[in-house]
């Protein structure tokens, strides 16, 4: 006569997180008497999941009535697969004793489990950089299984090459991360822009998720400044115009400075907001000739975005404006700085 | 699908006799084969289970005098150095009781040892 | 070896009783319910009732329960019907495989 064989007929079975596995397996004999177990894994560390004899395993069920005449159908459907979960199975039949002793196992059922990665996260730089510069956004998925992962990086919709990526841990694990970086070059009409990180895996069913991240959070764009002086008013004042243009973020101080002193100091707000992005500002500052009997050194000194100050400087010559006559004189540029330096 | 014993007679104490279980409508192949005797007017006694092999096993009082054996489709009890106290009908029944207990049984051979 | 005490060793009731029978183990039976029933009637073999203590085998009425577990079991007859009158067996299983021992015993009649 043959001896008792144990047969676990799936070499593998894969199971979607949140489902229930079904783990096969039939003796070919009721002799001798003894309990059939499921362990997870082998060896003396093996984790029991499920004794016919005994104990209480809430999540096991077994699939044919164990109690039933002739049964030797010992397969068993676990419940509420998690990642944690995936191993290999193994069969085992037991022989009734004291205690009782292992007679023969099944071949075991490596037990996979399709585990959904979680929502891209896509983080940019801590600090902001400007046109030409080179940032880097991170994206990370974790908590995914099995190990194969697809992660492209996209700008306006173009996917971007300049991209390092890896699947964490190298080895066999319940589930798996993904971390990647991608390098952006900054142009000045980026404000707009936006970086998405895509993710697809067999579990989506071809709908990828997706991770963005908004240039604005990462740019600056620094202001032009330019300087004008208006033609002279009828009660010797002289309206001089400092335009501040296309800059990105909103955060910006202006000062006015006569002849070095403190004359006015502005907060930009609620500014309306350009098609790029960018903002535009002019502050007007009226100078009464009159009173000065020297030329007039005005600057206009802008702080954005916590950056050094920009300055425009530029003298309104007294001499050049008779008390009983208007001008049209434009000013004249002391400091032009025309960039902010990084 | 039933179990019939034959074998059984007088045999003279110190005697052997080899009681058959033969089966018909199933296979014993997959299952244990035990015995179990009944002396006239007492209650019932488990004697041993045949399996396969190695997995052949007696209680205590009949290890040594009583072995057994099986095909697929009959069991074989061999008694030997019989005596007095032997005298019982000897039923064979499928099954190696817990999970798997004695049914069908066999309708039972008497087996009377005397001089 | 492990020993079955049933009890009463007979009992006299009648047609539609409720009808209980005790079996008490010298130990704890294998996983706690190596435990069944047999019926059996003069001149015939025993039939099974019931195995791993509580299960009704097939084809048994449901009339038939047994419980208990570890070393205390009983069969219970709900009504007695007049093909219940038989004897009645609990056999119990030690762990070892070749431990296994019949009760003594319990003859119903009729009253």
């Known amino acids: 006569e043959e001896e008792l064989q144990v047969i676990q007929p799936e070499k593998s079975v894969s199971v979607a997180a949140g489902d229930s596995a079904t783990l096969n397996c039939t003796v070919s004999s009721l002799i001798p008497v003894g309990p059939i177990q499921w362990f997870r894994g082998a060896g003396p560390g093996r984790e029991l999941i499920y004794n016919l004899k005994e104990g209480h395993f809430p999540r096991v069920t077994p699939v044919s009535d164990p109690t039933k005449r002739n049964n030797m159908d010992f397969s068993i459907r676990i419940s509420n697969i998690t990642p944690a979960d995936a191993g290999t199975y193994y069969c085992v039949k037991f022989r009734k004793g004291s205690p009782d002793v292992e007679l023969k196992s099944g071949a075991g059922t490596e037990l996979s489990v399709r585990a959904k990665p979680s929502a891209p996260v896509v983080s940019g730089p801590a600090v902001r950089a400007t046109a030409e510069h080179t940032v880097s956004f991170t994206c990370e998925s974790h908590g995914f299984s099995p190990r194969d992962i697809t992660l492209k990086w996209f700008k306006n919709g173009n996917e971007l090459s300049d991209v390092q990526t890896n699947v964490d841990p190298a080895g066999k694990s319940v589930s798996y991360s993904i971390r990647s970086t991608a390098r952006v070059v900054l142009t000045r009409r980026d404000v707009h822009s936006q970086v998405i990180c895509e993710v697809a895996h067999v579990t989506l069913q071809g709908d990828p998720l997706r991770g963005t991240a908004n240039l604005s959070e990462a740019i600056r764009v620094p202001p032009f400044l330019e300087v004008t002086q208006q033609s002279m008013r009828a009660d010797n004042q002289v309206n001089v115009t400092c335009q501040v243009t296309k800059f990105y973020p909103q955060r910006l101080q202006l000062t006015w400075l006569e002849n070095g002193n403190v004359s006015r100091t502005e907060m930009a707000s609620a500014l309306p907001e350009n098609k790029d992005g960018t903002y535009n500002w002019t502050s007007w500052l009226l100078v009464n000739v009159s009173a000065h009997r020297d030329d007039v050194k005005l600057t206009c000194q802008v702080e954005h975005d916590g950056q050094p100050a920009v300055n425009k400087s530029f003298s309104v010559k007294v001499s050049a404006h008779p008390k009983e006559q208007g001008s049209n004189t434009a000013a004249e540029n002391t400091g032009t700085n025309e960039r902010n330096i990084y | 699908r039933q179990l019939v014993e034959s074998g059984g007679g007088l045999v003279q104490p110190g005697g052997s006799l080899r009681l058959s279980c033969t089966a018909s409508?199933?296979?014993?192949?997959?299952?244990?084969i035990s015995w179990v005797r009944q002396a006239p007017g007492k209650g019932l006694e488990y004697i041993g289970t045949?399996?396969?092999?190695?997995i052949t096993y007696f209680a205590s009082w009949a290890k040594g005098r009583f072995t057994g054996s099986k095909t697929s489709s009959t069991a074989y009890m061999e008694l030997s150095s019989l005596r007095s106290e032997d005298t019982a009908v000897y039923f064979c029944?499928?099954?190696?009781?817990?999970?798997?207990?004695?049914?069908?049984w066999g309708q039972g051979t008497l087996v009377t040892v005397s001089s | 070896d492990i020993v079955m005490t049933q009890s009463p060793s007979s009992l006299s009731a009648s047609v539609g009783d409720r009808v209980t029978i005790t079996c008490q183990a010298s130990?704890?039976?294998?996983?706690?319910?190596?435990l069944a029933w047999y019926q059996q009637k003069p001149g015939q073999a025993p039939k099974l009732l019931i195995y791993l203590a509580s299960t009704l085998a097939t084809g048994v009425p449901s009339r038939f329960s047994g419980s208990g577990s570890g070393t205390d079991f009983t069969l219970t007859i709900s009504s007695l019907q007049p093909e219940d009158f038989a004897t009645y067996y609990c056999l119990g299983g030690g762990d070892d495989e070749a431990d296994n021992t019949f009760g003594q015993g319990t003859k119903v009649e009729i009253k």
């Open positions: 409508g199933f296979s014993l192949s997959s299952h244990g």
């Open positions: 029944a499928r099954g190696s009781a817990w999970n798997d207990p004695f049914d069908p």
């Open positions: 045949i399996g396969t092999g190695v």
């Open positions: 130990q704890s039976v294998y996983g706690n319910n190596d």
